[in-house]
């Protein structure tokens, strides 16, 4: 279970530099099930709390300190976020552009046991993992530009995610 | 590996009663959340709560079931679930079930480990 | 909240015949999407998951299928042992309470 991806309420939220409204993007298969593309075009906020970034509807923060894995989902939780779920190619762009060169934990991790790996609301994800042989059961982005395979008891920077409001 | 129930009998409205969960041939530790699910007679089924088996005994409600269920690991094999305030509404096989998760990981997915229930009637 | 609604309540179908349960989403689930079977005095038993996975022990007979919102059950070469009620449930956690959404069954006559 993990919180709603709402703020509890407007305190801190400030507009951002970008307004207007944006509709969901197709999701490509590897991202996950093809089952975006069944969902109906909708409007979103504009309205993110300090030191996020707003991108279509949506608000991420990027953390300057790193953590664990379980960490950085317990902050992104007390935000009223999840970490980011990067089902599209073009949200894995725009974050990866703002990551640079470091690597930041996002919402995609391995169930010991199992061998799928699962964005964090416990849908598949179908795409490629880098290094996913070392035993290693979390993800990052950045450096690379691909989805690679983390130790979770390894301290990395992290990216939340919220919807705009 | 197997769950097996027990507690269930008739009880008034208004009562309480405690429901165990003991599992055989695996422990309730980490990759595993323990849950019940209930089922009124010829009816469906309605999943009422879960915990996680690890240390930190994450435990997650069905927002009906919040305030009058509790959910609890007692040992290693055991789990309960009191249930306060009941009604005739109530009447119910309750089942325990055990999912795939991991608090650290976020999954709780699949219930794939059911035990055969126990029968609860609220009567006065 | 989560709805999952089963279609049809009863279905009855020959030995040999094949029968198609459906359930749907009340909001895009991402397949996360399990199916159970369930015959009288026994608990549920878990035959598919994410959508179309068959789970241990299961016969290749049953297929799942579906994405967003809608899914399918079919078993075909139906055999008396089949004779069940069936149950979708939804594990998508979408960050509210009411996880664990359950359909409300659908009972398979084999004739």
């Known amino acids: 279970y993990f919180p709603q991806v709402f703020g509890k309420s407007n305190d801190g939220f400030v507009p951002t530099e970008s307004y207007g409204t944006t509709s969901v993007q197709n999701v490509s298969q590897i991202f996950g099930r093809n089952d975006e593309s069944t969902m109906p075009t909708r409007s979103y906020g504009t309205v993110c709390p300090r030191n996020w970034d707003f991108h279509q509807g949506k608000c991420f923060f990027f953390s300057f300190s790193e953590s664990p894995w379980k960490d950085s989902m317990d902050y992104c939780a007390t935000q009223g976020s999840t970490l980011a779920i990067v089902n599209t190619p073009e949200k894995l762009k725009y974050l990866q552009d703002i990551a640079g060169i470091e690597n930041y934990f996002i919402g995609l991790v391995r169930q010991p046991g199992e061998k799928k790996w699962r964005w964090i609301n416990n849908s598949v994800f179908n795409g490629n993992v880098t290094n996913q042989d070392q035993n290693f059961d979390c993800v990052t982005i950045g450096l690379t530009k691909t989805y690679d395979a983390a130790s979770c008891e390894v301290s990395y920077r992290w990216i939340c995610e919220m919807n705009a409001k | 590996q197997s769950l097996e129930e027990s507690g269930g009998g008739l009880v008034k409205p208004e009562g309480s009663l405690t429901l165990t969960c003991k599992a055989s041939g695996f422990t309730l530790s980490s990759y595993y959340y323990m849950c019940w699910v209930r089922q009124a007679p010829g009816k469906g089924l309605e999943w009422i709560a879960c915990?996680?088996?690890?240390?930190?005994?994450?435990t997650v409600y069905a927002s009906w079931a919040k305030g009058r269920f509790t959910i609890s690991k007692t040992s290693s094999t055991t789990v309960t679930l009191q249930m306060t305030s009941l009604t005739a509404a109530d009447t119910a096989t309750y089942l325990c079930?055990?999912?795939?998760?991991?608090?650290?990981?976020?999954?709780?997915?699949?219930?794939?480990?059911w035990g055969p229930g126990t029968l609860v009637t609220v009567s006065s | 909240a989560l709805v999952m609604t089963q279609t049809p309540s009863s279905v009855s179908a020959a030995v040999g015949g094949t029968v198609t349960i459906k359930c749907q989403a009340s909001q895009n689930i991402y397949s996360t999407l399990a199916w159970y079977q369930q015959k009288p005095g026994q608990p549920p038993k878990l035959l598919m998951f994410d959508a179309s996975d068959l789970a241990s022990g299961v016969p290749s007979r049953f297929k799942g299928s579906g994405s967003g919102t809608e899914y399918t059950l079919t078993i075909s070469d139906l055999e008396p042992a089949d004779a069940a009620t069936y149950f979708c449930?939804?594990?998508?956690?979408?960050?509210?309470?009411?996880?664990?959404?359950f359909g409300g069954g659908t009972e398979v006559v084999v004739k």
């Open positions: 079930a055990r999912k795939l998760g991991d608090v650290g990981y976020g999954h709780t997915t699949y219930f794939n480990l």
């Open positions: 915990i996680y088996a690890g240390s930190s005994g994450t």
């Open positions: 449930q939804t594990y998508y956690d979408s960050g509210s309470d009411d996880l664990n959404a």
